[in-house]
Interface confidence: low
């Protein structure tokens, strides 16, 4: 009797997933001397162990504990940049501002960035055909649970002033259902975090509106204030100029509003 294979709604595991994770781990530990003690084979074994042979709709944070443990890493708690729906600019920013960190600048985030993975119940196979979609299939899938786990820990580690980059071109600039809105906001520690500063990134060149007055930003301010954390907001009208001024802060054009 041919085995029926579950067809999920989302794309399957990224091609060459094991090789990609291992290669990224090796590269990361070479670039970051403080992580050179990490055994990348053990990291891959722990990653694999989190989802292989498990039903891809029944993954828990516990499944990722061995990987979390191996990925233990110190990041400056006052140099954390969160982002929502604007990953590329956030990463361009930390590539220039080298002392600030997004989750994807940490080992665990770097390993999984832009990848998809899932297994099958009771077999050691990786499913390259399809994986569960968060909305259409189930939320407790390997990818969603991974990002929820690492995002919660990353937010919990933050201190002093935490920055978040938000996409001003979207209808919901702050989205309660995003990872930032559903996980990170609620795991900032009020006894450590003094201020959350939002950077709202404008899309259009002629867009001079004050997007800090947007109803969803006011909603974010309300959530943060109730958690006894101060809130501030800045419009970044010209993201291209913003990045240029981070690279060359002494440029005379960088004294005006960005």
């Amino acid at each position: 009797v041919p085995r029926w294979r579950q067809q999920w709604s989302g794309p399957g595991t990224t091609k060459r997933f094991p090789e990609t994770v291992l290669a990224r781990c090796v590269k990361y530990t070479e670039i970051h001397p403080e992580m050179r003690h990490v055994d990348c084979q053990s990291v891959w074994d722990a990653f694999k162990g989190a989802f292989i042979s498990k039903h891809p709709c029944n993954i828990t944070e516990e499944d990722y504990q061995p990987l979390m443990k191996l990925g233990t890493q110190t990041v400056p708690c006052n140099k954390i940049l969160l982002w929502s729906r604007i990953k590329d600019l956030a990463h361009q920013f930390t590539q220039v501002q080298r002392d600030m960190f997004t989750l994807e600048d940490t080992l665990l985030g770097y390993l999984a960035d832009d990848l998809t993975w899932c297994g099958e119940f009771n077999t050691s196979k990786i499913n390259y055909q399809s994986c569960p979609d968060w909305r259409k299939d189930c939320s407790n899938n390997p990818v969603s649970v991974f990002w929820k786990t690492v995002s919660r820990r990353f937010a919990e580690a933050a201190c002093d002033v935490v920055h978040v980059m938000l996409n001003g071109s979207r209808s919901k600039i702050f989205d309660k259902n995003s990872t930032f809105g559903s996980v990170e906001v609620h795991n900032l520690q009020p006894e450590k975090v003094q201020t959350l500063e939002a950077w709202v990134i404008h899309g259009g060149r002629e867009d001079s509106r004050d997007l800090c007055q947007d109803p969803t930003i006011k909603e974010l301010e309300s959530i943060i204030s109730k958690r006894n954390i101060q809130f501030s907001c800045k419009n970044i009208y010209r993201p291209d100029k913003f990045l240029q001024c981070v690279k060359n802060p002494e440029d005379s054009s960088c004294t005006s509003e960005i």
Epitope: H37, Q65, K69, E156
Partner: antibody, heavy 119, light 107 residues
Framework: QVQLQQSGPELVRPGASVKISCKTS????????MNWVKQRPGQGLEWIGR????????IYNGNFRDKVTLSADKSSNTAYMQLSSLTSVDSAVYFC????????????WGQGTTLTVSS | DIVMTQSHKFLSTSVGDRVSITCKAS??????VAWFQQKPGQSPKLLIY???HRYTGVPDRFTGSGSGTDFTFTIISVQAEDLAVYYC?????????FGGGTKLDFR
């Protein structure tokens, strides 16, 4: 708010055993290493070992391997350290301290538990 | 095990002075060094991590520097409440080890 609350002072006889607890709140207990540190009166700090509650992994300082047993109860978010075959050199203050995945160093400490071994 | 040596067991100072405490590792620990303050009857308190990063809520008069084997902890302008024992710690390899401590007192 992260808190580590240790059990109270202990006065025990030589040769006996004792179990010290460290009850945590305000963070994901399963996902951070819990460390134990010894401080003898007027002396410095000595790392005993650590436990990862998520999967029960334990790493001991070799100097304490035959003296100490670490454990953790995820249901109550509590870490434990048992010391056995006690002698006067075990008289000290014992601290629990956590280290999270992205947390810098030993950022939160318990208030300490004073152990006195005396006949 | 890596040995962390704090050369001074005691340092005498006065309010307003600049004071530096040194710590030497027996082998390269990159920047995996933290500094703690401990007052009598209290648990240690994290001040500096990763050699030079000030922990949240720590006044900016406390600074740390160094990498490799030589590390320095500095109080730029000593206050009365800074009287305590200061420990360095390396967490580059297991077991993590602490320096013997330097007690800061007033002249």
């Amino acid at each position: 708010q992260v808190q580590l609350q240790q059990s109270g002072p202990e006065l025990v006889r030589p040769g006996a055993s004792v179990k010290i607890s460290c009850k945590t709140s305000g963070y994901a207990f399963s996902g951070s290493w819990m460390n134990w540190v010894k401080q003898r009166p007027g002396q410095g700090l000595e790392w005993i070992g650590r436990i990862y509650p998520g999967d029960g992994d334990i790493i001991y300082n070799g100097n304490f391997r035959d003296k100490v047993t670490l454990s953790a109860d995820k249901s109550s978010n509590t870490a434990y350290m048992q010391l056995s075959s006690l002698t006067s050199v075990d008289s000290a203050v014992y601290f629990c301290s956590r280290w999270g995945t992205f947390t810098p160093s030993f950022d939160y400490w318990g208030q300490g538990t004073t152990l006195t071994v005396s006949s | 095990d890596i040995v962390m040596t704090q050369s001074h067991k005691f340092l005498s100072t006065s309010v307003g002075d600049r004071v530096s405490i040194t710590c030497k590792a027996s082998q390269d620990v990159v920047t995996a060094v933290a500094w703690f303050q401990q007052k009598p009857g209290q648990s240690p308190k994290l001040l500096i991590y990763s050699a030079s990063h000030r922990y949240t809520g720590v006044p900016d008069r406390f600074t740390g520097s160094g990498s490799g084997t030589d590390f320095t902890f500095t109080i730029i302008s000593v206050q009365a409440e800074d009287l305590a024992v200061y420990y360095c710690q390396q967490h580059y390899t297991t077991p993590t080890t602490f320096g013997g401590g330097t007690k800061l007192d007033f002249r």
